[in-house]
């Protein structure tokens, strides 16, 4: 049994890091493998992650971490029984994929203005809380070409757009994702999408 693709990990910079790797053949990840991880820190304890299958030869492990900070560095040991298959390290702050925003809501009752709001996925005491920027994707269910991205570079998790910038009388969907420049993160996954019917009064022409 050998590792074909070494583990690569990403952290949500809060409580979970996800590591994925591939074996050289079909593997029952949860019964045959264990990923041991330990913070390189005084008094830290070793933890064991039981991987799940991710395709025939692929495995994925969700590592639970407390109080993630930029100085953290973890040792990783991948075991198959008594055999050490791979040894490596992982610094969560250098491989951050933020959590997806939640609770995306479209408020349509504000005088021909659409107000989209969502929730910051981090608590206020997490460093990323004040450093996320967002991308909002709006698209028409009727017209695949009607697809737009709004970059939200301010901290407030909201976006206002004129309803008239979208077509009236049809349904739209929106979703939002986040990233943080400070840690050069990847984009988060998209939030679940929300749907609304866009209607507004055409301005009366003289």
């Amino acid at each position: 049994m050998k590792v074909l693709q070494e583990p690569t990990c990403v952290s949500d910079y809060m409580s979970i890091s996800t590591c994925e790797w591939k074996m050289n053949g079909p593997t029952n990840c949860s019964t045959e493998l264990r990923l041991l991880y330990q913070l390189v820190f005084l008094l830290s304890e070793a933890h064991t992650c039981i991987p799940e299958n991710n395709g025939g030869a692929g495995c994925v492990c969700h590592l639970l971490m407390d109080d993630v900070v930029s100085a953290d560095n973890y040792t990783l040991d991948l075991w198959a029984g008594q055999q050490l298959l791979w040894k490596g390290s992982f610094k969560p702050s250098e491989h951050v994929k933020p959590r997806a925003p939640g609770n995306l809501t479209v408020h349509t009752n504000v005088s021909d203005t659409l107000l989209l709001t969502w929730s910051n996925p981090y608590p206020p005491d997490n460093y990323l809380y004040n450093h996320l920027t967002y991308a909002v994707n709006i698209w028409s269910e009727n017209d695949p070409a009607d697809f737009r991205i709004y970059n939200v570079t301010y901290l407030e998790p909201s976006l206002r757009i004129a309803a008239s910038t979208l077509k009236s009388g049809i349904s739209y969907r929106a979703r939002v994702r986040a990233w943080a420049q400070c840690y050069n993160t990847t984009w988060s996954e998209w939030s679940p999408s929300t749907k609304w019917h866009n209607s507004y009064r055409e301005p009366f022409e003289q």
Epitope: L42, L43, S44, E45, D66, D67, V69, S70, A71, D125
Partner: antibody
Framework: QVQLVQSGAEVKKPGASVKVSCKAS????????MHWARQAPGQGLEWMGI????????SYAQKFQGRVTMTRDTSTSTVYMELSSLRSEDTAVYYC?????????WGKGTLVTVSS | QSVLTQPPSVSAAPGQKVTISCSGG????????VSWYQQLPGTAPKLLIY???KRPSGIPDRFSGSKSGTSATLAITGLQTGDEADYYC????????????FGTGTKLTVL
């Protein structure tokens, strides 16, 4: 919000021991290390040691080795710092502080006076 | 035990900028991150800066930190009378043993 509530002031005689408590609330107690530091009157801060509330393991500053004991009670989310063989130089305000590489939150401090 | 050296005192007028230095060795500041704490008279220390230059939520951007080599600096701009306090730098060292030294402390007086 995070709160670290420390026990009240103590007056002790030289040679005695003192046990200071620090009750934590507002966060997952076993997820954060706890430091102890002290500050003698008019002096600076001095680190004493650290405890991992998850397993209870400890490490102490060399200066206090053999005299200090840090423990925790997960059922009450409380950490304790006991200092023995007290001398007058141990008169200080003792602080617990939550954190790993740095101290995010501090208790208000417990004044321990050692006097004959 | 590692020693972090700070000036005993600094002073400046309201609205001015002041800097406080913190110097240590390669086994402490040189290898680690620096934090800064503010201690107002009669109160417990409070975290101002961590990770050399990051501010906890609620700390105004008048406070900033930097690190270069084996020394670090805390800068305070737009000084206010409420900033009058003792300031301590802190770090950690892992060799020969793990420890968390604090700086000697600096008394800031707002004139």
């Amino acid at each position: 919000q995070v709160q670290l509530v420390q026990s009240g002031a103590e007056v002790k005689k030289p040679g005695a021991s003192v046990k200071v408590s620090c009750k934590a609330s507002g966060y997952a107690f076993t997820s954060y290390y706890m430091h102890w530091a002290r500050q003698a009157p008019g002096q600076g801060l001095e680190w004493m040691g650290i405890i991992n509330p998850s397993g209870g393991s400890t490490s102490y500053a060399q200066k206090f080795q053999g005299r200090v004991t840090m423990t925790r009670d997960t059922s009450t989310s409380t950490v304790y710092m006991e200092l023995s063989s007290l001398r007058s130089e141990d008169t200080a305000v003792y602080y617990c502080a939550r954190g790993k590489y740095w101290m995010y939150d501090w208790g208000k401090g417990t004044l321990v006076t050692v006097s004959s | 035990q590692s020693v972090l050296t700070q000036p005993p005192s600094v002073s400046a007028a309201p609205g001015q900028k002041v800097t406080i230095s913190c110097s240590g060795g390669s086994s402490s500041i040189g290898n680690s991150y620096v934090s800064w704490y503010q201690q107002l008279p009669g109160t417990a220390p409070k975290l101002l800066i961590y990770d050399n230059n990051k501010r906890p939520s609620g700390i105004p951007d008048r406070f900033s930190g930097s690190k270069s080599g084996t020394s670090a600096t805390l800068a305070i701009t737009g000084l206010q009378t409420g900033d009058e306090a003792d300031y301590y730098c802190g770090t950690w060292a892992t060799s020969p043993v793990w420890e968390w030294p604090f700086g000697t402390g600096t008394k800031l007086t707002v004139l």
